[in-house]
């Protein structure tokens, strides 16, 4: 396979939805950003298609993203960070379809992370704690974090609570008890950089006490 | 202008250790940019072995990995290359250049030294 | 390892004439390529890179094409100090590796 678009493929390919939609990671990697890109339509043929991003780059006029089965990504040091990149995607020498986009407004943090649940017997509460590794960024520092919980058995039935900081207070006459809970959080930039949400941390599981009978309170496990 | 000059013994001894430093002006290895050492026999083609990235991580070619080690004193802005156990097939000029991994050329080369393997 | 075959090994030319050379991947590689000129005794230029972008201060009598597998460099007129060596390399996957290269003598 040459990777040349004969007349026919290009007048076919014209008929196709190019759609994609792009994320950015700053300093995802030390220093490095990221930049992931992907077609909308899971159906489409990529066989020839490749992703190109030129303008507000340091040092370079454009660059090539990477393919990795269905998705097109790019870790580099040389996003300017001020103003808007062409996104375009390609085939041979032909520019299909191109976004211009700001990559700062097109942010998805990491994931947070070492999220932990305590109880705490004299304060009939839990404490929430996670950790973020946007603490120690440079650029996306300031982040909205949603945690989410739910009675195990109650599937679909989320309560969420937003906060800026790393940790939660739970009251316990707000739980059920002697009950299995899951809790999870994800995050989104809040100040000046916009994007999307991270992907949710990985579950944390806890079990609210028991009531005591005798005071109406819960026991601790 | 980003400059880069190679430096080392022309001749090592088979067996012994093959060591190259890179001089880099006019750009800090600590920047940006992969830094890499590129080698030629006589009479052929161009092999790359290797590079150091700006964060100090390193990548080789698996037929040198064995053998190979490159490192950089960023006090010096330098880079260099440890071939070691050398053979006969190891006589090339040795080529420092930056560029690769998000850029697909190496745009700045050095001159070239060249290493001859004999007894 | 991704093989790059070059062809051909070697050409000889006239000045003014059109010169192309190929090089074809073992596999796909997007843009990830190359173009180099080498003369005896002297480190390689870049000419080429991402497959079709011409590198500064090249003369644009030289040009790039092709995506995935198949690449060709053209030089559109042959000039006395066009004839050297010239290499492709791709930067897709490790090792990064070269073509044989090309070798334009004067006819």
């Known amino acids: 396979e040459s990777g040349y678009a004969q007349n026919g493929d290009l007048e076919d390919a014209e008929l196709d939805d190019y759609s994609f939609s792009c994320y950015s990671q700053l300093e995802v990697n030390g220093s490095q950003h990221s930049l992931t890109c992907a077609f909308e339509d899971p159906d489409v043929n990529i066989t020839n298609l490749e992703f190109e991003i030129c303008g507000a780059l340091v040092e370079v006029k454009c660059l090539n993203f990477r393919k990795l089965q269905e998705i097109y990504f790019i870790e580099t040091k040389k996003f300017l960070l001020i103003g808007k990149s062409n996104i375009c995607v390609k085939v041979g020498e032909k520019s299909l379809t191109c976004k211009k986009i700001d990559l700062t407004t097109i942010v998805k943090p990491e994931a947070p992370f070492d999220l932990s649940v305590v109880y705490r017997e004299g304060a009939n509460d839990f404490v929430v704690t996670f950790n973020t590794s946007h603490l120690q960024k440079k650029y996306v520092k300031v982040l909205m974090h949603d945690v989410a919980y739910r009675q195990e058995k109650d599937e679909n039935k989320w309560t969420h609570v937003n906060l800026s900081s790393t940790k939660l207070t739970l009251l316990q006459r707000k739980l059920q008890p002697a009950a299995m809970y899951e809790i999870k959080v994800r995050s989104i930039p809040d100040h000046y950089f916009k994007g999307f949400w991270s992907e949710w941390s990985p579950s944390y599981y806890f079990r609210t006490p028991e009531i005591n009978n005798s005071s109406g309170e819960m026991d601790p496990i | 202008q980003v400059q880069l000059q190679e430096s080392g013994p022309g001749l090592v001894k088979p067996s012994e250790t093959l060591s190259l430093t890179c001089t880099v002006s006019?750009?800090?290895?600590?920047?940006?940019?992969?830094w890499n050492w590129i080698r030629q026999p006589p009479g052929k083609g161009l092999e790359w072995i290797g590079y150091?990235?700006?964060?100090?991580?390193?990548t080789y070619t698996p037929s040198l990995k064995s053998r190979v080690t490159i490192s950089r004193d960023t006090s010096k802005n330098q880079f260099s290359l440890k071939l070691s156990s050398v053979t006969a097939a190891d006589t090339a000029v040795y080529y420092c250049?930056?560029?690769?991994?998000?850029?697909?050329?190496?745009?700045?080369w050095g001159q070239g030294t060249t290493v001859t393997v004999s007894s | 390892d991704i093989q790059m075959l070059q062809s051909p090994s070697s050409l000889s030319a006239s000045v003014g004439d059109r010169v192309t050379i190929t090089c074809l991947a073992s596999?796909?590689?997007?843009?990830?390529l190359a173009w180099y000129q080498q003369k005896p005794g002297k480190a390689p230029k870049l000419l080429i890179y991402?497959?079709?972008r011409l590198a500064d201060g090249v003369p644009s009598r030289f040009s790039g094409s092709g995506s995935g597998t198949m690449f060709t460099l053209t030089i559109s007129s042959l000039q006395p100090e066009d004839f050297a060596t010239y290499y492709c390399?791709?930067?897709?996957?490790?090792?990064?590796?070269f073509g044989g290269g090309t070798k334009v003598e004067i006819k």
């Open positions: 250049a930056r560029g690769g991994y998000d850029v697909n050329y190496f745009d700045y």
């Open positions: 150091i990235f700006y964060s100090g991580s390193t």
């Open positions: 596999q796909t590689i997007g843009y990830w």
């Open positions: 390399q791709q930067f897709f996957s490790y090792p990064w590796t």
């Open positions: 006019g750009y800090s290895v600590t920047t940006d940019y992969a």
């Open positions: 991402a497959a079709t």
